[in-house]
Amino acid sequence: VPRWRQQWSGPGTTKRFPETVLARCVKYTEIHPEMRHVDCQSVWDAFKGAFISKHPCNITEEDYQPLMKLGTQTVPCNKILLWSRIKDLAHQFTQVQRDMFTLEDTLLGYLADDLTWCGEFNTSKINYQSCPDWRKDCSNNPVSVFWKTVSRRFAEAACDVVHVMLNGSRSKIFDKNSTFGSVEVHNLQPEKVQTLEAWVIHGGREDSRDLCQDPTIKELESIISKRNIQFSCKNIYRPDKFLQCVKNPEDSSCTSEI
């Protein structure tokens, strides 16, 4: 008789999840010499230990501490790029501007990017059928708690001028409920971070509005200012040109506003 299995509202664990995590770890440590000391089998064991045999609605940050310890990585604290609802452009940017880092350019972020995972209480099985949805089921699920944990640490590590890329095409350019709005903003350290500089990315080619005046950006400004961190905002009217100018800053067309 097949054992009864909890049905969740979200998609199940990404297929070949263990193999994917291990392969990504090996690839990352080969590309980044400063992380060559990392034992990827131990990393996988710690990752697995965070959620296997545990109820997928009862995961804590503490469960991920062994993985956090193994994945400890120093990034230049003044070269951090946060993003919200515009991951692809943020990643394209750091692929060109190699000295800047998104969370997904770190080992732990790279391992988990775009993956889903969860286990089942009291069994060593990975659940490939369904996993808890943050809204419909529970917020303390393995994926959400992982991203909350690594995002908090990433924000806490930042210093000097921190940049955040925001999607100007969305109704809420700054969303208090996003990982950036609910975790990262509140974990920037005022003693270390001088300025949060928001880059608002425009969607339409003919969109010349000043989206830095958007009410949600004013809300972000207020939150940041209350934490005694300076705030600045720039419109990126032409994201394609913006990337091109990051690649070729000497280009004569790159002196004008982008």
Epitope: D160, Q230, S232
Partner: antibody, heavy 116, light 111 residues
Framework: QVQLVQSGSELKKPGASVKVSCKAS????????MNWVRQAPGQGLEWMGW????????TYADDFKGRFVFSLDTSVSTAYLQISSLKAEDTAVYYC?????????WGQGTLVTVSS | DIVLTQSPASLAVSPGQRATITCRTS??????????MHWYQQKPGQPPKLLIY???NLESGVPARFSGSGSGTDFTLTINPVEANDTANYYC?????????FGQGTKVEIK
């Protein structure tokens, strides 16, 4: 390029007040906080605190709470340090410096001498 | 407050030699692998000049003769080789914890 230009030397009597200015150019004043650092004659450097140039909110080190006031006039890209009820021990060079933790840009310094 | 203790208080070095200044802090100034320790040079009548930020990063325009190292509570500024115009006071400073604090300074003289 970034420049911080401070007002000239001041000779004041005990009990008087002084206002030192620091004019920023080459960048937007409101993007970076302004720090103030004191150096008494022949002595080392003391961080007095900083002002958030975006909100105008000052933060003072414990030894500089009370008679010391940081302020701004963003319309002329200038930060100010005002010292009231001057004492002989306030005699020092006062520097403005940009950045929160490490100071890449400094004003040339303003010597404030307090003497009767 | 974090107390910074520099040693020696003064040193005299011949041109071409190595000068080493140490700065010890009363508690760690590290955060997430970054050390919030900075070094300045001050010549008479001039403001301090940033040499090294976050323990080992050379400020742009500063000669590569200057280098910084260390983590936690023990930090070193090295000048190698020393040149005649390196005569100055050198200060360490931490920004890991408010209030920011400076060392008492080290006077470097060239023989």
């Amino acid at each position: 390029q970034v420049q911080l230009v401070q007002s000239g030397s001041e000779l004041k009597k005990p009990g008087a007040s002084v206002k030192v200015s620091c004019k920023a150019s080459g960048y937007n004043l409101t993007n970076y906080g302004m720090n103030w650092v004191r150096q008494a004659p022949g002595q080392g450097l003391e961080w007095m605190g900083w002002i958030n140039t975006y909100t105008g909110e000052p933060t003072y080190a414990d030894d500089f709470k009370g008679r010391f006031v940081f302020s701004l006039d963003t319309s002329v890209s200038t930060a100010y340090l005002q010292i009231s009820s001057l004492k002989a021990e306030d005699t020092a060079v006062y520097y403005c410096a940009r950045y929160p933790g490490w100071f890449a840009y400094w004003g040339q310094g303003t010597l404030v001498t307090v003497s009767s | 407050d974090i107390v910074l203790t520099q040693s020696p208080a003064s040193l005299a070095v011949s041109p071409g030699q190595r000068a080493t200044i140490t700065c010890r802090t009363s508690e760690s100034v590290d955060s997430y692998g970054n050390s919030f320790m900075h070094w300045y040079q001050q010549k008479p009548g001039q403001p301090p000049k940033l040499l090294i930020y976050r323990a080992s990063n050379l400020e742009s325009g500063v000669p590569a003769r200057f280098s910084g190292s260390g983590s936690g509570t023990d930090f070193t500024l090295t000048i190698n080789p020393v040149e005649a115009n390196d005569t100055a006071n050198y200060y360490c400073q931490q920004s890991n914890e408010d209030p920011w604090t400076f060392g008492q300074g080290t006077k470097v003289e060239i023989k």
